[in-house]
Amino acid sequence: DSEEDEEHTIITDTELPPLKLMHSFCAFKADDGPCKAIMKRFFFNIFTRQCEEFIYGGCEGNQNRFESLEECKKMCTRDNANRIIKTTLQQEKPDFCFLEEDPGICRGYITRYFYNNQTKQCERFKYGGCLGNMNNFETLEECKNICEDGPNGFQVDNYGTQLNAVNNSLTPQSTKVPSLFEFHGPSWCLTPADRGLCRANENRFYYNSVIGKCRPFKYSGCGGNENNFTSKQECLRACKKGFIQRISKGGLIKTKRKRKKQRVKIAYEEIFVKNM
């Protein structure tokens, strides 16, 4: 794909609360791949905000592809029932908020956050980097949004809306206005290069989010993190071209890459998904 090719696209008005994805790949377009098999799979549709069926060709494609509807929901919705705002003031937390913190079996010593059901607060813990459970958040804010109660004892909704205590209406929460090209791609693309724990010297590439380029580094052969690719092309494909562009007001914007138009206007802010 030539990065010089550009297309102009127009934003459509679909009033929805701000979309907050569990995994960046949930924003990827359903991709049947180049092969010709007919395999029933599921993908998360950012427009309808639901997991839907599609036909997969059997090879390539992308990570927004699941064997079952349940798996899709588990990966791309915060909680299988989390779109329903309760008529009571207390919105249910996802089940995983009640799991104990779990470091997993590996030795990464990564700072993460978990909801402590004893103290009713999100707390820091050291995650080993593998296994563990879903009560594991990269930021304190994300943990609080999903698992902690709001100030008046009601749950903050995953889309940044709260149930108004007076009239049971949805009230938008104040949101920071993000920059035009804020990075919202795979979170591992933002992590620094990590040699890992072993003694090998393997040539790898990592995405340097400061300069926006893939750079070589020496990998030890074990441990480290996901910002680790065997080729520059693979690094670029995963990190350079998969981010979400956000703008604060509607209008016309240019998006690189010749591919089908994919646009959705969100209330309070717009999310633009660049096709992978």
Partner: antibody, heavy 120, light 107 residues
Framework: QVQLQQSGPGLVKPSQTLSLTCAIS??????????WSWIRQSPGRGLEWLGI?????????DYAVSVKSRITINPDTSKNQFSLQLNSVTPEDTAVYYC??????????WGQGTLVTVSS | DIVLTQSPATLSLSPGERATLSCRAS???????LAWYQQKPGQAPRLLIY??SRATGVPARFSGSGSGTDFTLTISSLEPEDFATYYC?????????FGQGTKVEIK
């Protein structure tokens, strides 16, 4: 050199409990750099991970959803071993059961395997 | 769950030939947490590769590569003792899962 020695019955009746033990030599069940697992293998299902225990300041476990309601893996620090209990077995639980050590690079040490047949 | 799909199911090759075994994951797997095992009839599996490193005592003809969702085990020149079944396994996220295996048989 780390070794794992499995013991337990090879025949279990349907609805009963399958119990196997894995004795560890050359490492400690309480090691903070290892984890201890049970895996089974049957012709129909291939290699199937059942569960894992590990000690990181306290004991943790994780079980496969397919057996979660029926499985318990327990450490025995005094004997330096760990055990598998699988309740309410059916003929589908017939398999070769392996215990294995996970040393953060994969399952690097395996027990010899125990063929468990569930039959009346 | 992360589903690991191995291909081909069977690989028929002669000693001295190069074997390339594929393991494709249904979701992202951290490459450090993908392992390869060799199993011979009547024996327990044996760890060969973790990430792209060889386990202790594994000959240099075995190598692992790949990242993301596509991983490869390569045996550069097959020896008679290499004819066996090979499994990939991930422990990036719970539950731990194995591929269904690739049998490398003598042609």
């Amino acid at each position: 050199q780390v070794q794992l020695q499995q013991s337990g019955p090879g025949l279990v009746k349907p609805s009963q409990t399958l119990s196997l033990t894995c004795a560890i030599s050359g490492d400690s069940v309480s090691s903070s750099s290892a984890a201890w697992s049970w895996i089974r293998q049957s012709p129909g299902r291939g290699l199937e991970w059942l569960g894992i225990i590990y000690y990181r300041s306290k004991w943790y476990n994780d079980y496969a959803v397919s057996v979660k309601s029926r499985i318990t893996i327990n450490p025995d620090t005094s004997k330096n071993q760990f055990s598998l209990q699988l309740n309410s077995v059916t003929p589908e639980d017939t398999a070769v059961y392996y215990c294995a050590r996970h040393s953060m690079v994969g399952f690097d040490v395996w027990g010899q395997g125990t063929l468990v047949t569930v039959s009346s | 769950d992360i589903v690991l799909t191995q291909s081909p199911a069977t690989l028929s090759l002669s000693p001295g030939e190069r074997a390339t075994l594929s393991c494709r994951a249904s979701q992202y797997v951290t490459s450090s947490y993908l392992a390869w095992y060799q199993q011979k009839p009547g024996q327990a599996p044996r760890l060969l590769i973790y990430g792209s490193s060889r386990a202790t005592g594994v000959p240099a003809r075995f190598s692992g590569s790949g990242s993301g969702t596509d991983f490869t085990l390569t045996i550069s020149s097959l020896e008679p003792e290499d004819f066996a079944t090979y499994y990939c396994q991930q422990y990036s996220s719970s539950p731990i899962t194995f591929g269904q295996g690739t049998k490398v048989e003598i042609k």
